[in-house]
């Protein structure tokens, strides 16, 4: 069966949008007006993994790019990266675990927990124009809550 996907944008709980920063990095900053067109559109794919009523496994690709967010160890630390893939083979229902995030719905906000590294979350900094990263703490200074906006195909 084909994997199901939808197009969306993400904003953190401070309403910062995500934009490309160089070829393999995302950063978070406040955008307004026409600048909103800079924000990254994700192709969110609903993939195989542990699911519950609040938790749905997804992969986050960049729309019309062969790039996916993935979680790997770098210098012994779980790290978020943009990974290039062969577009002939992706997306797929059985994504490798490094590409899988548990989309967790809490009080109308979303968290994206790494399936590869439990309790590590897609995170943004309070500061403007800083990289999106994988963080190992919730409820601290860093932001782990997002909202999702659907985008027509």
């Amino acid at each position: 069966a084909p994997v199901r996907s939808l197009n969306c944008t993400l904003r953190d709980s401070q309403q910062k949008s995500l934009v490309m920063s160089g070829p393999y990095e995302l950063k978070a900053l406040h955008l307004q007006g026409q600048d909103m067109e800079q924000q990254v559109v994700f192709s969110m794919s609903f993939v195989q993994g542990e699911e519950s009523n609040d938790k749905i496994p997804v992969a986050l690709g960049l729309k019309e790019k062969n790039l996916y967010l993935s979680c790997v160890l770098k210098d012994d630390k779980p790290t978020l990266q943009l990974e290039s893939v062969d577009p002939k083979n992706y997306p797929k229902k059985k994504m490798e675990k490094r590409f899988v995030f548990n989309k967790i719905e809490i009080n109308n906000k979303l968290e994206f927990e790494s399936a590869q590294f439990p309790n590590w979350y897609i995170s943004t900094s309070q500061a403007e124009n800083m990289p999106v990263f994988l963080g190992g703490t919730k409820g601290g200074q860093d932001i782990t809550d997002f909202t999702m906006q659907f985008v027509s195909s």
């Epitope: 069966a1 199901r4 939808l6 609903f46 699911e51 749905i56 719905e105």
Partner: nanobody, 123 residues
């Protein structure tokens, strides 16, 4: 052409049981996640339950967890929903959905659904 034909609905008293069936054709049934959604009178669609393509994973809405059981028989291209301890609030038209994917608590995506079978729970 994809066809989904639900059956098994009817009138049942509170606390009673029903077993819904969905006969599928026109696609490779065993390859697809399947599920049930329902629509109560005057309400919107509500996701009820899903089952993975292999049948090894099942998911339920909080409102039916512990009372309903979803299952599938790939050799018969049939999806089932065993409904126990039925309540008045379970009254709805129940639809079988093909390639049902839950986006979040309120939204789903699916490719096809059947014409539905009416379940009425009343004394």
């Amino acid at each position: 052409e994809v066809q989904l034909l639900e059956s098994g609905g009817g009138l049942v008293q509170p606390g009673g049981s029903l077993r819904l069936s969905c006969a599928a054709s026109g696609f490779t049934f065993e390859d697809y996640q399947m599920g049930w959604v329902r629509q109560a009178p005057g309400k919107g669609l509500e996701w009820v339950s899903s089952i993975s393509a292999m049948g090894n994973r099942t998911y339920y809405a909080d409102s039916v967890k512990g009372r309903f059981t979803i299952s599938r028989d790939d050799s018969k291209n049939t999806l089932y929903l065993q409904m126990n301890s039925l309540r008045a609030e379970d009254t709805a038209v129940y639809y079988c959905a093909e390639n049902l994917v839950r986006v979040d608590r309120r939204r789903w995506m699916f490719d096809y659904w059947g014409q539905g079978t009416l379940v009425t729970v009343s004394s």
